[in-house]
């Protein structure tokens, strides 16, 4: 029978090395065997390149195309082929369809004044246009209470978020994940980062540690502060361990 495209290709670029196009066929298709997506930069001397699509679902195909470091003027001509039959033809401008890379290495650290410091890495090298354009959304959720979740918008430059432990339930396990977008490029959101999980043991700090904590932490040097956090982490670890085994 004839091969038809049900939903034409939708493409996004990470604006550094890769563009991804996805489309849906009108029936289950072996994408890599039956289809090819050709792409060519609209630039003098540019060669034609071919992308072999993979199946995302029975009838959904996805093609990941290596591109050079994108610039605003870049426009690609795309042609979807089934053998000698041209199924679809269109153009794609990466700068107008940006989906940032996923932020990486999300970690949670205890910080001064009963706060948690969430840190992650900017997925772009400093020389890339997007490095300084990203803002982030951090989602913090209680692993045991679906209604206990918070969303934080990080619109300043640094990939960090300070979170007061008192805003979270004491003794609860929390997970955080982060995603990025680039406002000036009117991008879509990136995929969420993998989650990182930690135990929030906030109240009462004094009883739990068995000694008072100066507040504010006046006269306490960083070594003393580290000792407190190490002790706190050990207690948390033991509690968590105990919790999981009994």
């Amino acid at each position: 029978g004839s091969v038809k495209v049900l939903h034409e290709p939708s493409c996004f670029s990470d604006y550094i090395s890769t563009s991804v196009c996805q489309w849906k066929m009108d029936h289950p298709t072996n994408c890599s065997a039956e289809l090819r997506l050709s792409y060519q930069l609209d630039f003098m001397g540019s060669e034609n390149h071919t992308c072999v699509p993979e199946n995302r679902e029975d009838s959904v195909c996805v093609c990941s195309m290596p591109i050079d470091d994108a610039v605003e003027a870049d426009v690609y001509q795309l042609d979807l082929w089934a053998g000698q039959q041209l199924l679809w033809s269109g153009s794609f401008q990466p700068s107008k369809h940006v989906k940032p890379r996923t932020p990486g290495n999300l970690t949670v650290h205890p910080n001064i004044s009963h706060t948690w410091l969430l840190m992650w890495t900017n997925p772009y090298p400093t020389e890339n246009h997007l490095h300084s354009e990203l803002t982030y959304m951090v989602n913090v959720s209680n692993d045991n209470d679906p209604e206990d979740f918070k969303v934080y918008n990080v619109t300043y430059m640094g990939p960090t978020l300070r979170l007061a432990a008192s805003t979270l339930k004491s003794g609860a396990s929390y997970s955080a994940r982060v995603r990025a977008w680039a406002q000036t490029y009117n991008s879509t959101w990136s995929d969420w980062s993998p989650s990182t999980t930690w135990l929030n043991y906030y109240e009462p700090w004094e009883q739990h540690l068995g000694k008072p904590i100066p507040n504010p932490l006046l006269g306490l040097d960083s070594t003393g502060l580290n000792d407190i956090f190490e002790a706190q982490k050990i207690e948390w670890h033991e509690h968590h361990h105990h919790h999981h085994h009994h």
Epitope: M44, G45, S46, E47, N48, D68, D74
Partner: antibody, heavy 125, light 112 residues
């Protein structure tokens, strides 16, 4: 050493045909676009045609479109210009030159960084 | 087609002086930041042309730093400082952005 050597220039009558060759050495020929430029006696330079590294893309000046055909044989490191329906105004020295690197998605541009010595084409009755 | 216009068409300069040649394009040659597809070539008497400057300001291999290119968009300049007798010839600008690539009319540099 990067080198280009043209040949095939000759005296030909109007309406006649001629094929120019340009043999390249000293660089990875298939990775680069190649260009033909001509210069009529006592005149300036005129861009004629470009072909991408694989030979898949070709471009022509309006003055030669439909009459000239650029091609290449990457196995022989040779560039060609097939010239048909020649006119008196095609009389010129024809130079081949190495153009942009086209094996990358966006060609890397260095200008016309090496030129041949040229071959003279004279169209006259 | 993009039209390239050079000025002046001829120039006479004494050795040691600076020569400046202007090239103007009918459309912008700026593709992206820092990438102006404008070249400068020199054709010495009886020789093939040779590349001097590409992408507006980058010197070709082996070209002395006396030769410098500047400009962006539609207005470009080639400067030759401390001119030598060996710099005699015809200088051409060329746009490499759009097909057909096009040359300026050429500027003849004469050393006094």
């Amino acid at each position: 050493e990067v080198q280009l050597v043209e040949s095939g220039g000759d005296l030909v009558k109007p309406g006649g045909s001629l094929r120019l060759s340009c043999v390249a050495s000293g660089f990875t020929f298939r990775d680069y676009a190649m260009t033909w430029v001509r210069q009529a006696p006592g005149k300036g330079l005129q861009w004629v045609s470009l072909i991408s590294g694989s030979g898949g893309k070709t471009y022509y000046a309006d003055a030669v479109k439909g009459r000239f055909t650029i091609s290449r044989d990457n196995a022989k490191n040779t560039l060609y210009l097939q010239m048909n329906s020649l006119r008196a105004e095609d009389t010129a020295v024809y130079y081949c030159a190495v153009d942009r690197l086209t094996k990358t998605i966006r060609p890397q541009y260095y200008g016309l960084w090496v030129w041949g010595q040229g071959t003279l084409v004279t169209v006259s009755s | 087609d993009i039209v390239m216009t050079q000025t002046p068409l001829s120039l006479s300069v004494s050795p040691g002086e600076t020569a400046s040649i202007s090239c103007r394009s009918s459309q912008s040659l700026l593709y992206s930041i820092g990438y102006n597809y404008l070249d400068w070539y020199l054709q010495k008497p009886g020789q093939s042309p040779q590349g001097l400057i590409y992408l507006g300001s980058k010197r070709a291999s082996g070209v002395p730093d006396r030769f410098s290119g500047s400009g962006s968009g539609t207005d470009f300049t080639l400067r030759i400082s401390r001119v030598e007798a060996n710099d005699t010839g015809v200088y051409y600008c060329m746009q490499g952005l759009q097909s057909p690539n096009t040359f300026g009319q050429g500027t003849k540099l004469e050393i006094k």
